[in-house]
Interface confidence: low
């Protein structure tokens, strides 16, 4: 495939990544799938700069990100290391992260109305943000 050099229509470029901001709500799994079908992933926040950028675009609305602990430890969907990476949890959050992996837990992370993170029930229909890297090879065949 060819490398992306610019963002798709209706996506916003920031620091060599492209972002798409939903205006409807989906369960985390459905949002995750939506981004994958767009050859992207739920947003992975790696810095305070990126946090501020996303926060500016979503406003004070609960919004899914690509962080979950459904199989035990917290994991970013793109493999970014959680333990050493950027975090912006609300005080006393995450509060239900005993990592049972059995459903019914607060296993997915979202931006809250003030931008800080909370873990919540993955089935809640929140808005979401997709992200894809500009330097990533796209799935489209190269132009001949």
């Amino acid at each position: 495939g060819s490398e992306r050099t610019c963002c798709p229509v209706n996506w916003v470029e920031h620091e060599r990544s492209c972002y798409w901001f939903s205006r409807s709500g989906k369960a985390w799994a459905d949002a995750d799938n939506y981004c994958r079908l767009e050859d992207a992933h739920l947003v992975v926040v790696t810095s305070w700069e990126e946090q501020k950028f996303v926060q500016h675009h979503i406003g004070p609305v609960n919004t899914w990100m690509g962080l979950h602990d459904q199989n035990g430890p917290w994991k970013w969907v793109d493999g970014t290391d959680y333990e050493t990476g950027f975090k912006n949890w609300r005080p006393e959050q995450p509060d239900d992260w005993y990592g049972h992996g059995l459903g019914g837990g607060e296993d997915c992370a979202h931006f809250t109305d003030d931008g800080r993170w909370n873990d919540d029930v993955c089935q809640r229909p929140y808005r979401w943000v997709c992200e894809t890297e500009l330097d990533k090879a796209s799935q489209e065949p190269p132009l001949l």
Epitope: Q70, D96, H100, E106, V121
Partner: antibody, heavy 116, light 113 residues
């Protein structure tokens, strides 16, 4: 052994209120989501509400939203269901159940009858 | 809401024969991030609360006889009783716990011919 025991059911007039309790024993109560499920006479099962282990997250089915409130007291290993503005269609056996990816432990149920 | 349907409404099977109950969800309950189907099966005898038989569509609950098995993925699921026993004659429900509100199927009654 792991057990759930409901109480508080009874006969109430339309518009009235009732508070159901569910006493848990035999497991670490605060580690589990808990649900209330009801079953009208001769009918199927209807899941109505749940609450997270810490009590910070609740969810209500549309049929009870604004009328029913779920709460828990982890220190007392107890789950509660406050039912207000009761209607005839709320008549059912009410079960509390432990949510573990599938409802794996159920109480015997308590009967609520709403009738004038 | 995800709507759950079951078929047949009732079925009659000879003792020792196979009983098959189908459950269909109006949208997929499969979550690829953990490779699981968020579907459970319950048995309910008269005057008793439901009993969990199967969760994650195919995992048998502890203590459930191995004649009960679950299969399927996505939107189509099956509960199979490989050799019907007299104590299995009752009502069976499927339930999805993928999307709020969690919803049950209408139930299937199993009888002996």
């Amino acid at each position: 052994q792991v057990q759930l025991v409901e109480s508080g059911g009874g006969l109430v007039k339309p518009g009235g209120s009732l508070r159901l309790s569910c006493a848990a024993s035999g497991f670490t109560f605060s580690d589990y989501y808990m649900s209330w499920i009801r079953q009208a006479p001769g009918k199927g099962l209807e899941w109505v509400l749940y609450i997270s282990g810490s009590g910070t997250t609740t969810y209500y089915a549309d049929s009870v939203k604004g009328r029913f409130t779920i709460s828990r007291d982890n220190a007392k290993n107890s789950l509660y269901l406050q039912m207000n503005s009761l209607r005839a269609e709320d008549t059912a056996v009410y079960y509390c159940a432990r949510d573990r990816g599938g409802l794996d432990v159920w109480g015997q149920g308590t009967t609520v009858t709403v009738s004038s | 809401d995800i709507v759950m349907t079951q078929s047949p409404d009732s079925l009659a099977v000879s003792l020792g024969e196979r009983a098959t109950i189908n459950c269909k969800s109006s949208q997929s309950v499969f979550f690829h991030s953990n490779n699981k189907n968020y579907l459970a099966w319950y048995q309910q005898k008269p005057g008793q609360p439901p009993k969990l038989l199967i969760y994650w569509a195919s995992t048998r609950e502890s203590g459930v006889p191995d004649r009960f098995s679950g299969s399927g993925s996505g939107t189509d699921f099956t509960l199979t009783i490989s050799s019907l026993q007299a104590e299995d004659v009752t009502v069976y429900y499927c339930q999805q716990y993928f999307s709020l509100p969690f919803t049950f199927g209408p139930g299937t009654k199993v009888d002996i011919t």
